[in-house]
């Protein structure tokens, strides 16, 4: 699997928060590629040695996934081709809080961006009219 030398691509993330016990989204977008098979998405978490999630050649590759994320992650596979690398995190835990890296490899090159993910027991504010 080769990548284009030292070329870099633009990867963009947005800090977000997740409600404990619910599903959360870690947002990441990138310059899309023409072929899905040329796109690799890797999600990493600071302080965690295994991968959070990996998607390559059009499907999940979870052989190197860290145990703490087993069965709890997914990308939006049908949106990867248009540059959406966002990660769905199921059943958010307090320990999921931290710094994440969204790392992208395409035929154009590679790029990454970090995001801060907060977790807690958040509630929608009540609006009294």
């Amino acid at each position: 699997f080769g990548i284009s030398g030292r070329h870099s691509i633009t990867v963009t993330t947005v800090a977000s928060a997740g409600n404990i016990g619910e599903d959360g989204i870690l947002s990441c977008t990138f310059e899309p590629d023409i072929k899905l098979s040329d796109i690799v998405i890797q999600w990493l978490k600071e302080g965690v040695l295994g991968l959070v999630h990996e998607f390559k050649e059009g499907k999940d590759e979870l052989s190197e996934q860290d145990e703490m994320f087993r069965g709890r992650t997914a990308v939006f596979a049908d949106q990867v081709i248009v540059g959406n690398a966002s990660l769905r995190l199921k059943n958010v835990q307090l320990t999921d809080a931290g710094t994440y890296k969204c790392y992208i490899i395409t035929s154009k090159g590679k790029g990454n961006a970090n995001l801060e993910y907060k977790t807690g027991a958040f509630s929608m504010p009540e609006v009294n009219v």
């Epitope: 600071e46 295994g50 190197e64």
Partner: antibody
Amino acid sequence: EVQLLESGGGLVQPGGSLRLSCAASGFTFNTHAMHWVRQAPGKGLEWVSAISGSGGSTYYADSVKGRFTISRDISKNTLYLQMNSLRAEDTAVYYCARLLGRFGEYGMDVWGQGTTVTVSS
Amino acid sequence: DIQMTQSPSSLSASVGDRVTITCRASQTVYTWLAWYQQKPGKAPKLLIYDATNLATGVPSRFSGSGSGTDFTLTISSLQPEDFATYYCQQSYSTSWTFGGGTKVEIK
């Protein structure tokens, strides 16, 4: 100055135990994953074990799984390797090393001087 | 586990020579590859990380290239202090495997 200092090596009989220590200084210990790597006499480098910054995740080479235990004491800035059921093939210089990068994807940028473990009857 | 194969296992070269060492992974490791230098009786020293990035304090005559499964360490002009053993190591898989080493000797 960033430094790692191993201790605890020595001569032990087959089936015996040893605990290696690695004292860290000059950096924030709990933000870096740490490794143990060994080198048998006249041989190459062999990765042994790793532990995440928090200590929550641990990994082992197949050759030591079930016999060795890696741990860390953040209050003492110290990394440990508990070695049980030692075999002759565990004879080596043992190095502790710090993993470069916040996400574990880079190499080992700081190494200790090594401590020698000899397993022999 | 991912196997890392280095070649050659040893080579003889003279001061000023350009030296190239190759490392091949049994499956893709993307750019998650490091190179180390080790001298007898000493701990390894990190030279290159992320396949191409020079570690702090390492002379610019060292360079790394490659991605996927094939990687190269190049010493553009060999210096007396460069005679040592060099190792590649992957960190994509949580088995952190090393190559078998390449010993660079004086011709």
